[in-house]
């Protein structure tokens, strides 16, 4: 039996930040679980891990340098990402593993979310207005 995951098809990261909600066909309340977010078609980069243990404080970390946080809902984990770069525009996949109670469960691969990181548009300084338009 596999957990189903729903994600938004696309999100735009303005100000280099985005919130990605992973919705599961499973209630995570009072479960020990490991929710993770993966980057790339092959999910090669583990962006962020949220570890939950019986509704206690979530433990959040990234082995790949991403600034992330997580929030738990009954059937969802929302990943908050900060300081994203334009070249990190990619497809991101939610993954969930339930370790306890038995049986161990994980998810069917989701369709993923394309996160489009928009560069900040810097206003020209009044001292350096830049080239004037013709």
């Amino acid at each position: 039996n596999k957990i189903l995951v729903k994600q938004s098809p696309m999100l735009v990261a303005y100000d280099n930040a985005v919130n990605l909600s992973c919705k599961y066909s499973y209630n995570l309340f009072s479960r020990e679980f490991r929710a993770s977010l993966h980057k790339g078609l092959d999910s090669a980069v583990e962006v962020c891990v949220v570890y939950g243990n019986y509704s206690q404080q979530l433990q959040v970390y990234s082995k790949t340098g991403f600034n992330c946080d997580g929030k738990l809902g009954n059937e969802s984990v929302t990943f908050y990402l900060q300081n994203l770069y334009v070249n990190q525009t990619d497809i991101y996949f939610c993954k969930i593993e339930v370790m306890y109670p038995p049986p161990y469960l994980d998810n069917e691969k989701s369709n993923g979310t394309i996160i489009h990181v928009k560069g900040k548009h810097l206003c020209p300084s009044p001292l350096f207005p830049g080239p004037s338009k013709p």
Partner: antibody
Framework: EVQLVESGGGLVQPGGSLRLSCAAS????????MHWVRQAPGKGLVWVSR????????SHADSVRGRFTISRDNAKNTLYLQMNSLRAEDTAVYYC?????????????WGQGTLITVSS | EIVLTQSPATLSLSPGERATLSCRAS??????LAWYQQKPGQAPRLLIY???NRATGIPARFSGSGSGTDFTLTISSLEPEDFALYYC?????????FGQGTKVEIK
Amino acid sequence: EVQLVESGGGLVQPGGSLRLSCAASGFTFSSYWMHWVRQAPGKGLVWVSRINSDGSSASHADSVRGRFTISRDNAKNTLYLQMNSLRAEDTAVYYCARAPSSSWYDFDYWGQGTLITVSS
Amino acid sequence: EIVLTQSPATLSLSPGERATLSCRASQSVSRYLAWYQQKPGQAPRLLIYDASNRATGIPARFSGSGSGTDFTLTISSLEPEDFALYYCQQRSNWPPTFGQGTKVEIK
């Protein structure tokens, strides 16, 4: 005026435990991420742990993960660091620090620090 | 993790002189860099955030510049109270990391 006051430091044997506290005042404590940063004698600053504003999530440096636990009591405006399985290399001044609302990992106000010495 | 290298380790100057401190990152941190001042026996104090923005209450003689991997903290004219340790810190990547510090001492 923002104030952060740490307490709970002292001498502890290797393998022992200690709980640090940081009493906050002068700002809406429950609205801010909080951190612990340490500084070994004569050395530089090293980030240790963080907790989000409502206490529902936390992160720890690899060197302390599984041994240290950060927590907070927003009703008491207090931040905590539970330190277990202490090692000699944990000897340091421990500072609590506030993150500004605009970013998770800058530190705009710091406490005066509390010294932990791990030695037999 | 990102390594920040500060130079020089020690800067010996007289009051009134200009101080230029450097911080180099092992990879780009965009503009997510802060500077702190620490005096002996005291807590660090935030001076500059996001490479060039002065924190509340910081005098105009302190300025920051740079982006990517190379950053500079400039103290235009040193006051007696400016002789201290200075640290840079990045928040671009997790975990946040600090440089090893530059000591500005009286010549």
